[in-house]
């Protein structure tokens, strides 16, 4: 009679996660009698997949009927496949006995699992920082095998060139990491911009999954400052307005001093966004000239986004002469800037204002 | 460790019927086949009919097919054979086994349950 | 139905010397390359013990002095040594189709 051959004839086998995996099997002879055994891994640590002869394996059916008259074909099929269950299987023939003594193994069939990545999370910076200034995104995606995957950026459509992914972990594993940092440059116009993370991977079909992040929640756009003063009216009262433009985001704290006293703080809200996604905001404020002897110094106080303060000032002559209705101007703007003008250069007053 | 264990002695009437059971433990009950031989005394050995329990699938002697019927109990690894109208040459052992190697043979025994029939 | 017939009936063997039954199909048991012939061992009191099995292959822990051999309808147990526990009766076994029994060959120490 024949040698007994234990005949595995796919050396590999590649299953989707969730789905059964088929494990094919044969003998070449009824001889000797003996019950099949299933191992994953070789050696005194491997482990028992399904026996034959005895035991509960609830996810484990044998193909073939074991009770079938000259079975000889042992495949095995293995239900709901995570990729826990990667690994080399063995069939092994045993002969029967007490115990049963191993005879002869089949070659192995390496199960790989195809899992798909988790969608990917893309997390921004802590604190948001002003345009110019570099920030940093990171992508995450979890669970996939096999472990070769393709990680892209893009800012508003563009791809980005500047990040470092990670496939983690180096060897082999049942599943696999991947961890991308992309460096992106704020502009004043990214605060309707967007960062995508896109993971694309064998078991996507050509669909990749994505990840967004919005840059308003990384971006500060500090306001610029500016003054406007309408003519004198009757009651002898000068209307100052300070405009603050195009900052984001919206939380803004406005403060107006009148030679160094507060006068009035204002807070912020509910205001019309500009195209770009900042904000403009107009305070005013009116003078009473005649009941000042002395020239009045404005101040206009921003706090933007607990932020120092920006100061911007203003001078409002009080001139000798009687004022008329409709007359000239009886104030000028001296151009002091305590606190950079719309330029943001930092002077020397008691506020630092750092960028960041 | 296969074991095949056998309920008690019987003593029947003729016309009677007998139900003998048999407890398997020591291997996966449904993967095998449980075979009933039965040996009248001084005897050879008569096989009888043979079941899958698995599937509850059955093969019987012609000889038996009108009086035998075989179950199994899969919850308890148990088989059964029961056998009717009783005749008095049906005084026999009747054993169980299993077959080990889907060969239709009969590897692990019973040690046998002596069923005698007598008026 | 396959109908097995055993020769002899009885057998009385000097210790150490070789016995020899034999057991005729009255048609081939063979099939696929397998002859389904099966010799089973039973001493008084006991169940039968499964010593053969496709003709020629040894069960587990069945000494190797008992051998089998034979193909189509005609098979031989054979014990190249008689040991005194060998006293018992032997039967063959067929599975081409349902399986069916031998008589019986009663092995006796001359």
């Known amino acids: 009679e024949e040698e007994l051959q234990v005949i595995q004839p796919e050396k590999s086998v590649s299953v989707a996660a969730g789905e059964s995996a088929t494990l094919n099997c044969t003998a070449t002879s009824l001889i000797p009698v003996g019950p099949i055994q299933w191992f994953r891994g070789v050696g005194p640590g491997r482990e028992l997949i399904y026996h034959q002869k005895e035991g509960h394996f609830p996810r484990v059916t044998p193909v073939s009927d074991p009770t079938k008259r000259n079975n000889m074909d042992f495949s095995i099929r293995i239900s709901n496949i995570t990729p826990a269950d990667a690994g080399t299987y063995y069939c092994v023939k045993f002969r029967k006995g007490s115990p049963d003594v191993e005879l002869k193994s089949g070659a192995g069939t390496e199960l790989s699992v195809r899992a798909k990545p988790s969608a990917p999370v893309v997390s921004g910076p802590a604190v948001r920082a002003t345009a110019e200034h570099t920030v940093s995104f990171t992508c995450e995606s979890h669970g996939f095998s096999p472990r070769d995957i393709t990680l892209k950026w893009f800012k508003n459509g563009n791809e980005l060139s500047d990040f470092q992914t990670n496939v983690d972990p180096a060897g082999k594993s049942v599943s696999y990491s991947i961890r991308s940092t992309a460096r992106v440059v704020l502009t004043r116009r990214d605060v309707h911009s967007q960062v995508i993370c896109e993971v694309a991977h064998v078991t996507l079909q050509g669909d990749p999954l994505r990840g967004t992040a919005n840059l308003s929640e990384a971006i500060r756009v500090p306001p610029f400052l500016e003054f406007t003063q309408q003519s004198m009216r009757a009651d002898n009262q000068v209307n100052v307005t300070c405009q603050v433009m195009k900052f984001y985001p919206q939380r803004l704290q406005l403060t107006w001093l009148e030679n160094g006293n507060v006068s009035r703080t204002e807070m912020a809200s509910a205001l019309p966004e500009n195209k770009d996604g900042t904000y403009n905001w107009t305070s005013w404020l009116l003078v009473n000239v005649s009941a000042h002897r002395d020239d009045v110094k404005l101040t206009c106080q921003v706090e933007h986004d607990g932020q120092p303060a920006v100061n911007k000032s203003f001078s409002v002559k009080v001139s000798a002469h009687p004022k008329e209705q409709g007359s000239n101007t009886a104030a000028e703007n001296t151009g002091t800037n305590e606190r950079g003008s719309s330029d943001y250069k930092d002077d020397d007053d008691k506020h630092h204002h750092h960028h960041h | 460790q296969v074991q095949l264990v056998q309920s008690g002695a019987e003593v029947k009437k003729p016309g009677a019927s007998v139900k003998v059971s048999c407890k398997a433990s020591?291997?996966?009950?449904?993967?095998?086949?449980i075979n009933w031989v039965r040996q009248a005394p001084g005897q050879g050995l008569e096989w009888i009919a043979m079941i899958d329990p698995s599937d509850s699938e059955t093969h019987y002697n012609q000889i038996f097919k009108d009086r035998a019927t075989l179950t199994t109990d899969t919850s308890t690894s148990t088989a059964y054979m029961e056998l009717r109208s009783l005749r008095s040459d049906d005084t026999a052992v009747y054993y169980c086994a299993m077959d080990y190697g889907s060969l239709y043979a009969m590897d692990y025994w019973g040690r046998g349950t002596l069923v005698t029939v007598s008026s | 139905d396959i109908v097995l017939t055993q020769s002899p009936d009885s057998l009385a063997v000097s210790l150490g010397e070789r016995a020899t039954i034999n057991c005729r199909a009255s048609k081939s048991v063979s099939s696929s390359g397998y002859n389904y012939i099966f010799w089973y061992q039973q001493k008084p009191g006991q169940p039968p013990k499964l010593l053969i099995y496709l003709a020629s292959n040894l069960d587990s822990g069945v000494p190797d002095r008992f051998s089998g051999s034979g193909s189509g309808t005609d098979f031989t147990l054979t014990i190249s040594s008689l040991q005194a526990e060998d006293v018992a009766v032997y039967y063959c076994q067929h599975s081409r189709e349902l399986p069916t029994f031998g008589q019986g060959t009663k092995l006796e120490i001359k």
């Open positions: 020591g291997y996966t009950f449904t993967n095998y086949w």
